[in-house]
Amino acid sequence: KFSKQSWGLENEALIVRCPRQGKPSYTVDWYYSQTNKSIPTQERNRVFASGQLLKFLPAAVADSGIYTCIVRSPTFNRTGYANVTIYKKQSDCNVPDYLMYSTVSGSEKNSKIYCPTIDLYNWTAPLEWFKNCQALQGSRYRAHKSFLVIDNVMTEDAGDYTCKFIHNENGANYSVTATRSFTVKDEQGFSLFPVIGAPAQNEIKEVEIGKNANLTCSACFGKGTQFLAAVLWQLNGTKITDFGEPRIQQEEGQNQSFSNGLACLDMVLRIADVKEEDLLLQYDCLALNLHGLRRHTVRLSRKNPSKECF
């Protein structure tokens, strides 16, 4: 229960706080969970414990694993676990989902993006900010303390924002980057852009040859009159009606509207008698309104038929 997931990139600093809290006067011991070996407190070590903090300066992929922290007071011991994963640096610009911190939302009135985990580090301003790997330039962007302020937010400001800063430890500098998604909400509080909730991007759906399969494309649209709001499936970039395969049909599924004016639509793709050639197709779930288009791609893979018991 008292377990926390932490992640970082190789050759960057990573600092992890013990999920169990205690007074500053309490001692905290850190161990490698697998070996029960104590983690040193001497700062000359690359990985060392410093009270409630576990420091990787810098982190290596081999550091990945579960670490145990024990908060010791005169009357009790509290145990916590830090599940640490260190990833190799990505060669391309794409930040994978597992490296993302929680999504934040902004509107015209409030558009602060806080740099995740920065409070754990000894850093000095200014922070550097990037959007989709491009350094942010222009007077609309202001790096202020540990957050970024965007003036006159537009739907185009949605995207993945990375903050980069330097952690200083005893005169040595270590780079740290952290990325989170930013979505733009209308004043009623939901993204103006369509939001696809299912399927996940690049999802692999297991199907059995000869059986029927259903794929659901489900998306929500922001508050207000939606002059154009549609959810649909495409096969290899072609509309279902134009694809000309009678075994594959789409039909409208559940539609529901919610108290904040949010409207959500489902479109179910039904594939009858799945064939080998269906596995070669690209299935695109599209959601569009006047603010833009979102696309999530699904591929089918063969599921080994379950062994029947007689």
């Epitope: 926390k4 929680s102 934040v104 509080g189 909730g197 299912a198 489900s218 929500c220 599924g253 919610f258």
Partner: nanobody, 118 residues
Framework: ESGGGSVQAGGSLRLSCAAS????????MGWFRQTPGKGREGVAS???????IYGNFVKGRFTISEDNAKNTLYLQMNSLKPEDTAMYYC?????????????????WGQGTQVTVSS
């Protein structure tokens, strides 16, 4: 899930859903209900940022909340009506994009029956 049962119209119930085994920083949890012969209907959802969304029929009568320390999701139901009679399910997904749409959710509870009599 727990907390279901029988209640008179106008009464209250509090449903609980205890989750175990997840430590995700980005998540969405929801409550759904289903009556015989009908599809699951979204009641309410809450995500890791604390954003809540309710089905139009709720009209301020229900409140979704969570206790992170206990990994528990709640649905406080007040001013219950006979038409609220249904099997109630809690569900979760590992993404903070959130709305109470059944097709969005991966993990489902077993359900708890709520019966409201007039």
């Amino acid at each position: 899930e727990s907390g279901g049962g029988s209640v008179q119209a106008g009464g209250s119930l509090r449903l609980s859903c205890a989750a175990s085994g997840y430590t995700y920083s980005r998540y969405c949890m929801g409550w759904f209900r289903q009556t015989p012969g009908k599809g699951r209907e979204g009641v309410a959802s809450i995500n890791s940022d604390g954003t809540t969304i309710y089905g139009n029929f709720v009209k301020g009568r229900f409140t979704i909340s969570e206790d992170n320390a206990k990994n528990t999701l709640y649905l406080q139901m007040n001013s219950l009506k006979p038409e609220d009679t249904a099997m109630y399910y809690c569900a979760a997904r590992v993404d903070s994009t959130c709305a109470p749409m059944p097709s969005w959710f991966t993990y489902w509870g077993q359900g708890t029956q709520v019966t409201v009599s007039s």
